[in-house]
């Protein structure tokens, strides 16, 4: 069974700069999975944000512009990489990867 | 049928204003990030302006920045553009367009033309 | 500011291939997608995630990324195809346009 460790504990971003979240694979074929990042903010429920499915194909969350949310999956490292771009306010909360084993 | 409709463009004076329109239907309109594009007479496409669902995240071109303001209302299933100090490059046809899960625009309004002339 | 070229026109006969380049700073890490805008229309989205094809779009309709390059490529081409062809992307929360490509069927 995969398994899944977010090293950062906490990022700390200024406003309008780029932050990037990892997500390590283990015991399981990165490639041979479909990665999923969620964000739950301070007082509301969870919320899907992006994907990327084991055949490469990205998915967002339609409610959020394209370009804001960027996911990668690096096979020799075993990571998948969000990536939030041009900080705001709005970001602020806890992101959380998940895996789904095809 | 998902369907996109552009309305209020027209002639007017530099340093006048308009309010750009667009009304959904066919879809979840409430459940999808949107966009303003443009197209000069005989030139290629423009990006204006982006908005999320629920308008927490706003995005505008430089070109158009402290002039033009994105807005929505969901209620309504409609998508808007204030454009405020216009000058004669805005001269174009707007388009309103869907912003797809899979990462695209796959569905475009018809377009208004805005004219901006003295 | 983010910039993606593309050929100003590509000429091709009827039954030909036709490939229509694109070309931005490392356009191979990010999602471009093609657009096809016939006169007095509004434009049709024909590739998205470099690759892919919306339904409905012909299967003669196909495109490539890598390196600083995207590349729509139509196999067969009809007069039908005759337009106008636009690149995108996105450089972080900016869209992107390329200039557009006027492709004539000879």
């Known amino acids: 069974a995969g398994h899944l460790e977010q090293p950062q504990i906490s990022s700390t971003k200024t406003l309008s700069k780029t932050a990037r979240l990892e997500c390590v694979v283990s015991g399981i074929t990165i490639s041979a999975t479909s990665v999923y990042w969620y964000r739950e903010r301070p007082g509301e429920v969870i919320q899907f944000l992006v994907s990327i499915s084991y055949d490469g194909t990205v998915r967002k969350e339609s409610g959020i512009p394209s370009g804001k949310f960027e996911v990668d999956r690096i096979p020799e490292t075993s990571t998948s990489t969000l990536t939030i771009h041009n900080v705001e306010k709005q970001d602020i909360a806890t992101y959380y990867c998940a895996l789904w084993e095809v | 049928e998902v369907q996109l409709v552009e309305s209020g463009g027209g002639l007017v004076r530099p340093g006048g204003s308009l309010r750009l329109s667009c009304e959904a239907s066919?879809?979840?309109?409430?459940?999808?990030?949107m966009i303003w594009v443009r197209q000069a007479p005989g030139k290629g496409l423009e990006w204006v302006s982006s908005?999320?669902?629920?308008?927490?995240?706003?995005y505008n071109a430089d070109s158009v920045k402290g002039r033009f303001t994105i807005s929505r209302d969901n209620a309504k299933n409609s998508l808007y553009l204030q454009m405020n100090s216009l000058r004669a490059e805005d001269t174009a046809v707007y388009y309103c367009?869907?912003?797809?899960?899979?990462?695209?625009?796959?569905?475009w309004g018809q377009g208004t033309t805005v004219t901006v002339s003295s | 500011s983010y910039e993606l070229m593309q050929p100003p026109s590509v000429s091709v006969s009827p039954g030909q291939t036709a490939s229509i380049t694109c070309s931005g700073d490392?356009?191979?890490?990010?999602?471009a997608c093609w657009y096809q805008q016939k006169p007095g229309q509004s434009p049709v989205l024909v590739i998205y995630?470099?690759?892919k094809r919306p339904s409905g779009i012909p299967e003669r309709f196909s495109g490539s990324n890598s390196g600083k390059t995207a590349t729509l490529t139509i196999s067969g081409t009809q007069a039908m195809d005759e337009a106008d062809y636009y690149c995108?992307?996105?450089?972080?929360?900016?869209?992107?346009f390329g200039g557009g490509t006027k492709l004539t069927v000879l």
């Open positions: 367009a869907r912003d797809w899960e899979l990462l695209g625009f796959d569905c």
């Open positions: 066919g879809f979840t309109f409430s459940s999808y990030s």
């Open positions: 908005i999320s669902s629920s308008s927490d995240y706003i």
């Open positions: 490392k356009l191979g890490d990010k999602y």
């Open positions: 995630q470099h690759n």
């Open positions: 995108q992307a996105w450089d972080s929360t900016t869209v992107v």
